[in-house]
């Protein structure tokens, strides 16, 4: 079932966004998402991940920014930024530590 | 660095009112679930109630020695909940603890991580 | 309510043995995602509680690796490989599948 969580080890991770229920949440992995909607500030979002860990190899673009990470509240101080109308060379570590 | 901060305990007669604040700091309120726990003398832990965010519903649940007397409330803008005890009982003397926790992002689940020191209520004639 | 029953009530133990806590309740605690909600928490004198260990047996963020959680379904046990004297205080269980979360009546752990 591809829905279904594994059980697998849990990380703890800085929760900040409007998901959260707490300070902290576990998941399989931790994330950091930075999302701009049409004509607003750019938002970044830490929390946890457990469906979908293909979306932390995406590549910036100029709307979102995916970011994660696999160690406890590694992704507390991570500051991501969106890619340029005209994207440069590929950033790296976008799923990495 | 979470920090959760309890006062408003002290001695009151059975029948009567108190009401405990905790301050929060370190963390976003709002989003926070927010549970009292509490503790008689030499006795052990009694999970009392919980708000949930505004986000979801900002409903409340209580354990049922103390539902239709105890009210969890929450101020975001002051990033403090309360707790208003009514018709108080000498069996609510306890030490009452603050706490907020994490949730496992695939269910339900929810831990008690995060404690204040307590504060002492006293129900006594 | 789900019931939560821990044994020993007390526990002397030797600085450097083995110590080991039960817990059982009253229904499964095992989630249809394969971990059982069920905590571990130390209150040690004059202390609040501290969680040791969450989903039956992971350990908590800065908990020393001599404790451990295991079991599953409606029996639990927390193990300490070798105590120290640090470890005395009042250890407790928690179900966290249903609303009211319930604890055990505790397990005192003291030095011989």
């Known amino acids: 079932d591809p829905v279904k969580p594994s059980r697998g080890p849990l990380v703890t991770c800085t929760c900040e966004s409007p998901h959260c229920k707490g300070p902290t949440c576990r998941g399989a992995w931790c994330t950091v998402v930075l999302v701009r909607e049409e004509g607003r500030h750019p938002q970044e979002h830490r929390g946890c991940g457990n469906l979908h860990r293909e979306l932390c190899r995406g590549r910036p673009t100029e709307f979102v920014n995916h970011y994660c990470c696999d160690s406890h509240l590694c992704n507390h101080n991570v500051s991501l930024v969106l890619e340029a109308t005209q994207p440069p060379s590929e950033q790296p570590g976008t799923d990495g530590q | 660095e979470v920090q959760l901060v309890e006062s408003g305990g002290g001695l009151v007669k059975p029948g009567g009112s108190l009401r405990l604040s905790c301050a929060a700091s370190?963390?976003?309120?709002?989003?926070?679930?927010m549970s009292w726990v509490r503790q008689a003398p030499g006795k052990g832990l009694e999970w009392v109630g919980r708000i949930k965010s505004k986000s979801d519903g900002g409903t409340t649940d209580y354990a049922a020695p103390v539902k239709g007397r105890f009210t969890i409330s929450r101020d975001d803008s002051k990033n403090t909940l309360y707790l208003q005890m009514n018709s108080l009982k000498t069996e609510d003397t306890a030490v009452y603890y603050c706490t907020t926790g994490n949730y496992y992002d695939g269910s339900g689940y929810y831990s008690f991580d995060y404690w204040g020191q307590g504060t002492l209520v006293t129900v006594s004639s | 309510d789900i019931v939560m029953t821990q044994s020993p009530l007390s526990l002397p133990v030797t600085p450097g043995e083995p110590a080991s806590i039960s817990c059982r309740s009253s229904q499964s605690l095992l989630h249809s995602n394969g971990y059982n909600y069920l905590d571990w928490y130390l209150q040690k004198p004059g202390q609040s509680p501290q969680l040791l260990i969450y989903l039956g047996s992971n350990r908590a963020s800065g908990v020393p690796d001599r404790f451990s959680g295991s079991g599953s379904g409606t029996d639990f046990t927390l193990k300490i490989s070798r105590v120290e004297a640090e470890d005395v205080g009042v250890y407790y269980c928690m179900q966290a599948l249903q609303t009211p979360p319930t604890f055990g009546g505790g397990t005192k752990v003291e030095i011989k």
């Open positions: 370190g963390f976003t309120f709002s989003n926070a679930w």
